[in-house]
Interface confidence: medium
């Protein structure tokens, strides 16, 4: 149904009084500068707010910051700046919040020029207390927590030293010099690149990749001639310079760098780049940039070893290294990703895949929308989604697409309906089935957020004028109510709700401006009284994900299995609650050719599910590098898609014979690796 407040919309009873009783204003005794907000822990209600204000003086910039803490989801704040000795905190480092529910926080302070090292403030009790610690180095990066042990921290210094702490920043030790990049791996392992001849920039392509599994007691060189490295899922990737020229190739390891295989991906030149778009324990999406300044490249999807890649999408929009791509993982439905392609006429179009990159299609035109001026045929067009690229181009798009794992099937995004993305003012669209179908939800650009696992959607109009109205929907965006949360409009700067979309609180941030001053202000609205009762069994309905034809036996089969979910009925106005767990029921599907990707040396012609041999490889033995050995591949062209759980059906057989010969093209063979101890 069309959005709005028509007769069909069941209004929430007495909502104004209910929300008025649950609206909490907090005015910050602060000059307006910048504000950053962090949630500490999950379901703790603890929020830290750091406000900073720079006063440009003639000779130098004088800075002032204040730290505030809330323990009731933002309804009340307490000024705790005295806990950090009224020190100016460096906002570029942000607030380093510990993993999981560790309750750990690290703030990095600004120190005067002549000091020996930096200063941090540490808390391990959800910011109730802080300990000041002077560092033996000046940090270059934010402190990084080990995902496995929040007491272990690493940081790079301005002198390119790699520093590690084993007691949550109390004591620090420099474990290596000349370090360019360092990352935590699994099991408290640290991977880092080092330079030999002067600087990271000068040695790019000649870096060494090192590993320590014991926080710096011993080291192993696991790669040479390294340009860069990255971690994704269970894969370690290194981009390695070729012997003969300036090209480089991706090598991959699944055993923390002990053995490497060359990924079957195109090599790239100096001006090109690789980018890991998404990775999990099953597979990886890899973008390979095209030669020249084209602004696009190709997406490849990997097999389960990260070695064999299938071409997934051509002309994938990705501007420059570290630039903008619209690639988005739709977390509310398994296997769904959205991104943009740059078509031959330089227009940008949105594509969606429902099967983890197997096939890409245009987004279906919303039923309640007309095709815009970009459409050649007014009856045939599709929805195009605005994401990072549109935001970078300063289009009137305040937010990227939004989805949440526990709000099953819901995707909210700005978009336009035509043959390509339009520069006109976008509207907001919603899908309740993971991107298969879309409906216009709100006219014009908005900020939006999901509360109570999808039970409530909240939106605020994006406007240059001050605002005092919030919109909310209890039926997945079909119908909207408006609530005036303050008499005095504020200049809106952002919506904040607890990550994970389980909360029923939303904070509206902004500032008030008067003749003399401007101040930060937040309004926190608790929707608990709108959703008066807890949801019961009758409030949920069975929904088959990826369903396109409910009668069809294979309907809903994606990656070898289908999933039934219990979804909240749109008509039910009730609380899923903070402890809500998505109820899903998987069942195995029969294997079809769609459950297999094409093996090395094979490809799928367009609109065909069969894999055929690449013409240039016909009749040749297929040989490729695996763990530094040359392998002979006997295959009928198929390999099971990573994460696919199908059984029975078709079963293409596959066999790999080890030729026991060394790969001449593998620069990361084990012989070139060495170890040393401190």
């Amino acid at each position: 149904s069309a959005p709005g407040e028509d007769e069909e919309c069941g209004r929430v009873r007495d909502f104004v009084a209910k929300l008025a009783n649950n609206t909490h204003q907090h005015v910050f005794d602060d000059l307006r500068g910048s504000v950053s907000l962090s949630w500490v822990g999950d379901s703790t209600g603890v929020i830290l707010v750091l406000t900073t204000f720079h006063v440009p003086l003639v000779i130098m910039t004088f800075g002032q910051s204040k730290l505030y803490r809330s323990e009731d989801y933002g309804k009340n704040f307490k000024d705790i700046t005295d806990l950090i000795n009224n020190t100016f905190i460096r906002t570029e480092f942000g607030m380093a919040i510990g993993p999981e529910n560790s309750g750990k926080v690290v703030l990095t302070a600004e120190v005067s020029g002549g000091s020996r090292g930096g200063r941090i403030f540490r808390s391990s009790d959800f910011a109730k207390n802080f300990v000041q610690t002077d560092l033996p180095f000046h940090p270059l990066t934010q402190m990084m927590y080990s995902p496995q042990n929040s007491d272990y921290l690493l940081a790079l210094s301005t002198e390119n030293g790699l520093w590690v702490s084993k007691n949550f920043g109390g004591k620090w030790e420099e474990i290596h010099k000349a370090v360019c990049l360092a990352k935590w791996g699994s099991d408290n392992t640290i991977f880092f690149t080092t330079y030999a001849n002067g600087s990271c920039k000068a040695d790019l392509g000649a870096l060494e990749l090192w590993r320590t599994s014991d926080l710096g007691k011993s080291f192993k060189t696991i790669g040479v001639k390294i340009y860069s490295f990255g971690l994704g899922g269970r894969f370690l990737f290194a981009s390695v310079m070729a012997d003969k020229d300036t090209t480089r190739r991706i090598h991959v390891s699944t055993d923390q760098g002990d053995t490497w295989s060359m990924a079957q991906l195109p090599s790239v030149g100096q001006e090109q780049f690789y980018s890991i778009l998404a990775a999990n324990d099953d597979m990886v999406f890899m973008h390979v940039d095209e030669p020249g300044d084209t602004g696009f490249g190709t997406i490849f999807t990997s097999d389960d070893r990260g070695i064999v890649y299938s071409k997934s999408l051509d002309r994938h929009l990705y501007t420059t290294t570290g630039g903008e791509t619209d690639f988005t993982n739709v977390t509310s439905l398994r296997g769904v990703y959205i991104t943009s392609v740059l078509s031959e006429d330089n227009s940008i179009q949105t594509m969606i895949t429902f099967d983890q990159g197997g096939r890409w299609t245009h987004l279906r035109k919303p039923e309640n929308s007309e095709c815009d001026a970009t459409a050649k045929n007014k009856n045939e067009c599709s929805l195009h989604i605005h994401a990072s690229y549109s935001i970078s181009q300063k289009l009137n798009v305040p937010m990227a697409p939004l989805s949440e794992p526990n709000a099953v099937g819901i995707v909210i995004a700005h978009g336009s309906v035509g043959d390509a993305i339009s520069v006109m003012v976008p509207d907001v669209y919603i899908s309740d089935d993971g991107g298969y179908s879309w409906t216009k939800m709100l006219e014009g650009p908005h900020y939006y957020t999901i509360l109570d696992s999808g039970g409530i959607i909240v939106a605020i109009e994006h406007s240059s004028r001050p605002i005092n109205v919030i919109k909310f929907s209890t039926d997945e965006g079909q119908c909207w109510q408006t609530y005036t949360f303050t008499r005095d409009p504020i200049y809106f700067t952002g919506l904040a709700s607890e990550p994970g979309a389980r909360s029923m609180n939303i904070s509206i941030w902004g500032f008030t401006e008067s003749f003399l001053t401007s101040q930060w202000v937040s309004y926190t609205i608790d929707f608990k009284d709108i959703l008066e009762r807890n949801c019961e069994e009758k409030d949920y309905t069975i929904w088959l994900a990826h369903s396109t034809d409910p009668e069809d036996y294979e309907d809903g089969c994606i990656l070898g299995y289908k999933e039934q979910f219990l979804r909240l009925r749109k008509s039910s106005v009730c609380q899923n609650g903070r402890d809500y767990v998505v109820t899903k029921q998987p069942s195995i599907c029969l294997c079809s050719l769609e459950d297999f990707l094409c093996d090395f040396g094979y490809y799928r012609p367009e609109n065909d599910s069969k894999c055929v041999e690449q013409p240039e490889l016909k009749g040749h033995d297929l040989e490729f590098c695996l763990y530094g050995r040359e392998e002979h591949l006997t295959t009928n062209g198929y390999r099971k898609i990573p994460g696919d759980k199908c059984q029975g059906g078709v079963n293409p057989v596959r066999e790999v014979k080890d030729l026991k010969k060394k790969c001449t093209s593998n620069f990361l063979s084990p012989e070139k690796q060495n170890s040393k101890s401190n």
Partner: antibody, heavy 118, light 107 residues
Framework: EVQLLESGGGLVQPGGSLRLSCAAS????????MSWVRQAPGKGLEWVAI????????YYSDTVKGRFTISRDNSKNTLYLQMNSLRAEDTAVYYC???????????WGQGTLVTVSS | DIQMTQSPSSVSASVGDRVTITCHAS??????IGWLQQKPGKAFKGLIY???NLKDGVPSRFSGSGSGADFTLTISSLQPEDFATYFC?????????FGQGTKVEKR
């Protein structure tokens, strides 16, 4: 009315062959997965084989794999089970049943008796 | 293969009684279970799918519960036409497997 009607059962010697048919009516046959299930005298139900709605994909229980072939002709709304190398333990009433993406084994035929004996 | 253990194998009951039949799966099957009814000389009939969902046209006195490995079929008030044999079936994984059946007979 939704109906399934099996035929083709009878007495056959060990090592012999038989082809069962299941005629469907009252629903869109081509969109449903179809199964064969059997019940030996005095025993429980045993699922035998399934075929996908388009007919491209099949799955068999280990006890019949390599000997039985499930197939379908959507133009004739008919499901088949070709049984070769029959054994005494294949003696049972054979039922055909339909499955959709939501429903498994919701509609059944009356069954046809297959007796394997010398 | 997943084994489905159904109990009891038979139950004697009178019209109006509450009858409960259980099925235990040898491993977790989420809610991928159906319940079937077989009357002598009649075709099998599907009653419940996905553990708890009543097939259209099935009286509301039939209900299903459970998730994971333990499931129950309940007939809240037995009617004359309910004397039959009931089977559970799992369809979480191939090969699909059935319970041994529970015969509900007149006391």
């Amino acid at each position: 009315e939704v109906q399934l009607l099996e035929s083709g059962g009878g007495l056959v010697q060990p090592g012999g062959s038989l082809r069962l048919s299941c005629a469907a009516s009252g629903f869109t046959f081509s969109t449903y997965g179809m199964s064969w299930v059997r019940q030996a005298p005095g025993k429980g139900l045993e699922w035998v084989a399934i075929i996908s709605s388009g007919g491209s994909y099949t799955y068999y229980s280990d006890t019949v794999k390599g000997r039985f072939t499930i197939s379908r002709d959507n133009s004739k709304n008919t499901l088949y089970l070709q049984m070769n190398s029959l054994r005494a333990e294949d003696t049972a009433v054979y039922y055909c049943s339909r499955s959709s993406s939501h429903w498994y084994f919701d509609v059944w035929g009356q069954g046809t008796l297959v007796t394997v004996s010398s | 293969d997943i084994q489905m253990t159904q109990s009891p194998s038979s139950v004697s009951a009178s019209v109006g009684d509450r009858v409960t039949i259980t099925c235990h799966a040898s491993q977790g099957i989420s809610s991928n279970i159906g319940w079937l009814q077989q009357k002598p000389g009649k075709a099998f009939k599907g009653l419940i799918y996905h553990g708890t969902n009543l097939k259209d046209g099935v009286p509301s006195r039939f209900s299903g519960s459970g998730s994971g490995a333990d499931f129950t079929l309940t007939i809240s008030s037995l009617q004359p036409e309910d004397f039959a044999t009931y089977f559970c079936v799992q369809y979480a994984q191939f090969p699909y497997t059935f319970g041994q059946g529970t015969k509900v007979e007149k006391r």
